[in-house]
């Protein structure tokens, strides 16, 4: 597994850097998630043919997979930094039971989709010290991920490959849209 | 990295229009957020537009919203901006460079490969 951003050798290197910003330290960890889910999706597509799957056909599912729409202030159109804070922080959250469901989907990888996991919860606490008004984020229902979580792992395996997939575009897009927006704040 | 080649640029009037290419043989250019940036003579480097590995992601400077479209063709490894309403303050060498994590910024550090420009010239 790849080490955690601040741990890499440069900065061990590099002892009398100025220390990361908090919107530093947040963009770099995004890419080192970034750089795990191209690592989990590079073993997903070598073992099923999902990617080279449309996205039309894929968008048939019942997945309801957290999506930055115009409403949310994270785009240009729009934009508007508090409203889109909390989308992302609010999307993290929501994408956490599915984090959660890729544990154990991985034979070769099974590391780095724990590393995606638990950066993805530092990243979390990083993005609520920086949110204004945390009153506006709501936090998933644990009865509800638990069930949800339960109808995943039930599923045949080619739905569950096809889940896997889902799944890691999906939250690859959402960061991408996140960091964009996040480096105009 | 991938090699990145500018065209499209030349002298226009103002008022006219050019569409700019950045080109790359890589073959996971559509993977890579592209940005446009300019340099006119004795200033920095600025930034123009960008688009993201999701096509819809574009942001653009607020000198060139409403005039200058950025789009992308997968297929032809290429992405475009489109320059119309061109204005003498407009000239200047464009340069594109492409991010690999597909987020794009208007900031040059977020790039990490950079073509070698095109120069855009508006004049009567």
């Known amino acids: 597994a790849p080490v955690p951003p601040g741990e890499d050798s440069k900065d061990v290197a590099a002892p009398h850097r100025q220390p990361l910003t908090s919107s530093e330290r947040i963009d770099k960890q995004i890419r080192y998630i970034l750089d795990g889910i191209s690592a989990l999706r590079k073993e997903t597509c070598n073992k099923s043919n999902m990617c080279e799957s449309s996205k039309e056909a894929l968008a048939e599912n019942n997945l309801n997979l957290p999506k930055m729409a115009e409403k949310d202030g994270c785009f240009q159109s729009g934009f508007n930094e508090e409203t889109c804070l909390v989308k992302i922080i609010t999307g993290l959250l929501e994408f956490e039971v599915y984090l959660e469901y890729l544990q154990n989907r991985f034979e070769s990888s099974e590391e780095q989709a724990r590393a995606v996991q638990m950066s993805t919860k530092v990243l979390i606490q990083f993005l609520q010290k920086k949110a204004k008004n945390l009153d506006a984020i709501t936090t998933p229902d644990p009865t509800t991920n638990a069930s949800l979580l339960t109808k995943l792992q039930a599923q045949n395996q080619w739905l569950q490959d096809m889940t896997t997939h889902l799944i890691l575009r999906s939250f690859k897009e959402f960061l991408q849209s996140s960091l964009r927006a996040l480096r105009q704040m | 990295e991938v090699q990145l080649v500018e065209s499209g640029g030349g002298l226009v009037q103002p008022g006219g229009s050019l569409k700019l290419s950045c080109t790359t043989s890589g073959r996971r250019f559509s993977s890579y957020a592209v940005g446009w940036f300019r340099q006119a003579p004795g200033k920095e480097r600025e930034f123009v537009a960008d688009?993201?590995?999701?096509?819809?992601?574009?942001w653009y400077a607020e000198s060139v919203l409403g005039r200058f479209t950025i789009s992308r063709d997968d297929a032809k490894n290429t992405v475009y901006l489109e320059m119309d309403g061109l204005k003498p303050e407009d000239t200047a060498v464009y340069y594109c460079a492409a991010d690999k994590y597909g987020v794009g910024g208007n900031a040059q550090g977020y790039y990490d490969s950079w073509g070698q420009g095109t120069q855009v010239t508006v004049s009567s």
């Open positions: 688009i993201g590995e999701q096509a819809e992601n574009t």
